[in-house]
Interface confidence: low
């Protein structure tokens, strides 16, 4: 069995190896061969060559999808905690304390009030703004908060929104809100959040956290 | 191995200033939040002052705030320690302290040190 096996490699071989011959004595013009002939065999040899070729570039997509996967794709994620401040500026200050999570060097915290990533995608993006008010002690209008995004060369732009009417407690009564939602960012993209009255804001222990996710 | 090279501490007068340095190596140094932590003659250990990975925010002592500055350089890999005017009872050698923690922090736990460095404050 493994004999005929054998012979038929061998075959195979021999017919190959007549194959080129026949092209090479086409590329140099032998009479003994029609024109006909040769084009025949010449389209037949390029269909061969672009059989392998393609087969080459599936092979290379294949080999830079399992990098993407491994090396290419690390994790980035962020998780920053409030931070108190004295700046009268609406922009939420955070800090990398208490329970904080900053991945890798893909992700970072910037002047204390932004999250800017280095890598283009789609992330999953997230708030969580706790604030004490007063309805007589504040104005008319409500807390808001605001999820801002600034992309290079682009204005800054508003993502995601959120008000609350303030409390009838006194001294104050807590609030909470929460915001998220799934954005694509490009490479060096920052993130940040905006309030309507940064004093009210409660920075206790778990209360006001801001963060991102690499889907 | 990590490694936790302190330098810089000397004799000063009061009011004086001295700028400690701190070596580090054998880790990654941007990923871990950094403190000094300093030891008076006969006391225990006092935490002076800490410092994020980014830079970002800095904590300090009631007993240093507005006089120390901790500050740090990634590049280098360096810590520093700019204290200015200095009283007799900031006497103490001065170490630096790695964080034990990375990504998650709990704060003043450390699982590396320096040699420290002895400061004297004295006329």
């Known amino acids: 069995h493994r004999r005929l096996d054998k012979i038929e490699d061998e075959r195979n071989l021999h017919e190959d190896f007549v194959f080129m011959k026949t092209i090479q004595r086409c590329n140099t013009g032998e009479r003994s061969l029609s024109l006909l002939n040769c084009e025949e065999i010449k389209s037949q040899f390029e269909g061969f060559v672009k059989d392998i070729m393609l087969n080459k570039e599936e092979t290379k997509k294949e080999n830079s999808f399992e990098m993407q996967k491994g090396d290419q794709n690390p994790q980035i994620a962020a998780h920053v905690i409030s931070e108190a401040s004295s700046k009268t500026t609406s922009v939420l200050q955070w800090a990398e304390k208490g329970y904080y999570t900053m991945s890798n060097n893909l992700v970072t915290l910037e002047n204390g009030k932004q999250l800017t990533v280095k890598r283009q995608g789609l992330y999953y993006i997230y708030a969580q703004v706790t604030f004490c008010s007063n309805r007589e002690a504040s104005s008319q209008a409500p807390f808001i908060a605001s999820l801002c995004l600034k992309s290079p060369g682009r204005f800054e732009r508003i993502l995601l929104r959120a008000a609350n009417t303030h409390s009838s407690a006194k001294p104050c009564g807590q609030q909470s809100i929460h915001l998220g939602g799934v954005f694509e960012l490009q490479p060096g993209a920052s993130v940040f959040v905006n309030v309507t009255d940064p004093s009210q804001v409660s920075h206790g222990t778990g209360f006001t956290s801001f963060g991102l996710l690499k889907l | 191995e990590v490694q936790l090279l302190e330098s810089g501490g000397g004799l000063v007068q009061p009011g004086g200033s001295l700028r400690l340095s701190c070596a580090a190596s054998?880790?990654?140094?941007?990923?871990?939040?950094m403190s000094w932590v300093r030891q008076a003659p006969g006391k225990g250990l006092e935490w002076v002052s800490e410092?994020?990975?980014?830079?970002?925010?800095?904590y300090y002592a009631d007993s240093v705030k507005g006089r120390f500055t901790i500050s740090r350089d990634n590049s280098k890999n360096t810590l520093y320690l700019q204290m200015n005017s200095l009283r007799a009872e900031d006497t103490a050698v001065y170490y630096c302290?790695?964080?034990?923690?990375?990504?998650?922090?709990?704060?003043?736990?450390?699982?590396?040190w320096g040699q420290g460095t002895l400061v004297t404050v004295s006329s």
């Open positions: 410092i994020s990975g980014s830079g970002f925010p800095t």
């Open positions: 054998g880790f990654t140094f941007e990923l871990y939040r």
């Open positions: 302290a790695k964080s034990l923690h990375d990504k998650t922090q709990h704060h003043q736990e450390f699982d590396y």
